[in-house]
Interface confidence: medium
């Protein structure tokens, strides 16, 4: 499993992971106490046939070509959690691990 | 976590799981001994904002709206393996569990 890493200066048009820092304060998400900012990353780019396909399934659907199947898109294929301090629904402040907050790898699926 | 299930008669335009039977013989994939056909399913449909978003990350990227982020697309969010009998690259016949061959759920990511 591998994926491309890019930055704002990259000329890569294919599916790639780009850096993105999310700022909760800028969003007005005041129920999140910490971190106020974190490195989330995101996926962007084109998915030419077979490039960075995570699953054999993606290839099979392309072969079968059913009605309405749009072809693969550039999406997170590996994500990781972060620890956060936040208000839960009961107005308690909780320290907890929130899954799938960081994109570690992008691919076509 | 939930996802929509549709069939060929559905009028649903949103991201949905559709039935798809993959036929390896029809593809000419003769290195797969068994199964010759299996129910793979696929994802198709529109991802309006917040609908069926698997990860909070998807929402955050939408909020941050970085250059080139294309918005979420309808993609498998839960997959399962199948057991297969197949020739490997060394002409050995192997019985093994192949991951991510069946789409169990679709969502927007």
């Amino acid at each position: 499993d591998f994926g491309l890493d890019c930055d704002e200066h990259s000329t890569e048009s294919r599916c790639c992971r780009y850096p993105l820092t999310v700022d909760f304060e800028a969003f007005g998400w005041d129920w999140i106490i910490a971190p106020k900012r974190y490195k989330a990353n995101y996926c962007s780019g084109e998915c030419e046939f077979v490039f960075l396909q995570k699953y054999p399934h993606t290839h099979l659907v392309h072969q079968a070509n059913p009605r309405g199947s749009a072809g693969p898109c550039c999406t997170p294929t590996k994500m990781s959690p972060i620890n956060m301090l936040y208000f839960n629904g009961k107005e308690q402040i909780i320290y907890g691990k929130i899954p799938a907050m960081v994109v570690d790898r992008c691919g076509c699926s | 976590d939930f996802g929509l299930d549709c069939d060929e008669h559905s009028t649903e335009s949103r991201c949905c799981r559709y039935p798809l039977t993959v036929d390896f013989e029809a593809f000419g994939w003769d290195w797969i001994i068994a199964p010759k056909r299996y129910k793979a399913n696929y994802c198709s449909g529109e991802c309006e904002f917040v609908f069926l978003q698997k990860y909070p990350h998807t929402h955050l990227v939408h909020q941050a709206n970085p250059r080139g982020s294309a918005g979420p697309c309808c993609t498998p969010t839960k997959m399962s393996p199948i057991n297969m009998l197949y020739f490997n690259g060394k002409e050995q016949i192997i019985y093994g569990k192949i991951p991510a061959m069946v789409v169990d759920r679709c969502g927007c990511s």
Epitope: I33, K36, K39, P81, I82, M84, Y95 | -
Partner: antibody, heavy 125, light 107 residues
């Protein structure tokens, strides 16, 4: 590295307001990974978290003290302060300031490190 | 609030001894617990974070274990500089709360 130096009176009269300041050196109080807190320790007793602030002014207080506590930040002076109103003898304690560190990767957090040197505050007339 | 109960409240031991201090939480706090050492007239110093991770620069004779509601701090071979008071801290639910402390004295 970051160091915290406390200042403020050691004696406060009952019903008055206790005021302490913590000056940060070796780092910016406006660092988005840093949070700034106060803890106290009555004589011969355990530690009690009072509250925590972020440089933007967002504050979180211990409910047991919330009605009497104000924590504020002065980014221009690189310091933050504690005010505790309507004090009684039960507020006699050693007061500490401390930093919390939250890494922006979300993987590593560090509570109460480093600490200030501590200020002994006696409430007495 | 989550209560942390430390035991024993005081302990006498000799240099070279192995000692264990326990901390019991009033509800499940996963592994969101730290251990601190405090010497007279000084600010506390963190020894252990996330229940079992050793703070950088802390000697390996200190170790932490546990999760949920039962935690312990073990000193494998006491050194003269280890005689101090030890506190546990939970950082799972605000307000953060500390144990009442265990005073480790020289026998």
């Amino acid at each position: 590295q970051v160091q915290l130096v406390q200042s403020g009176p050691g004696l406060v009269k009952p019903s008055e307001t206790l005021s302490l300041t913590c000056t940060v050196s070796g780092g910016s109080i406006s660092n988005s990974n840093y949070y700034w807190g106060w803890i106290r320790q009555p004589p011969g007793k355990g530690l009690e978290w009072i509250g925590t602030t972020y440089y933007s002014g967002t504050t979180y207080y211990n409910p047991s003290l919330k009605s009497r506590v104000t924590i504020s930040v002065d980014t221009s002076k690189n310091q933050f302060s504690l005010k505790l109103s309507s004090v009684t003898a039960a507020d006699t304690a050693v007061y500490y300031c401390a930093r919390d560190y939250y890494d922006s990767s979300g993987y590593y957090y560090n509570w109460f490190d480093p600490w200030g040197q501590g200020t002994t505050v006696t409430v007495s007339s | 609030d989550i209560q942390l109960t430390q035991s024993p409240s005081s302990l006498s031991a000799s240099v070279g001894d192995r000692v264990t201090i326990t901390c019991r939480a009033s509800q499940d706090i996963r592994n969101d617990l730290g251990w601190y050492q405090q010497k007279p007239g000084k600010a506390p110093k963190r020894l252990i974070y996330a229940a079992s991770s050793l703070q950088s620069g802390v000697p390996s004779r200190f170790s932490g274990s546990g999760s949920g509601t039962e935690f312990s701090l073990t000193l494998s071979s006491l050194q003269p500089e280890d005689f101090a008071t030890y506190f546990c801290l939970q950082h799972h639910i605000y307000p953060w709360t500390f144990g009442q402390g265990t005073k480790l004295e020289i026998k």
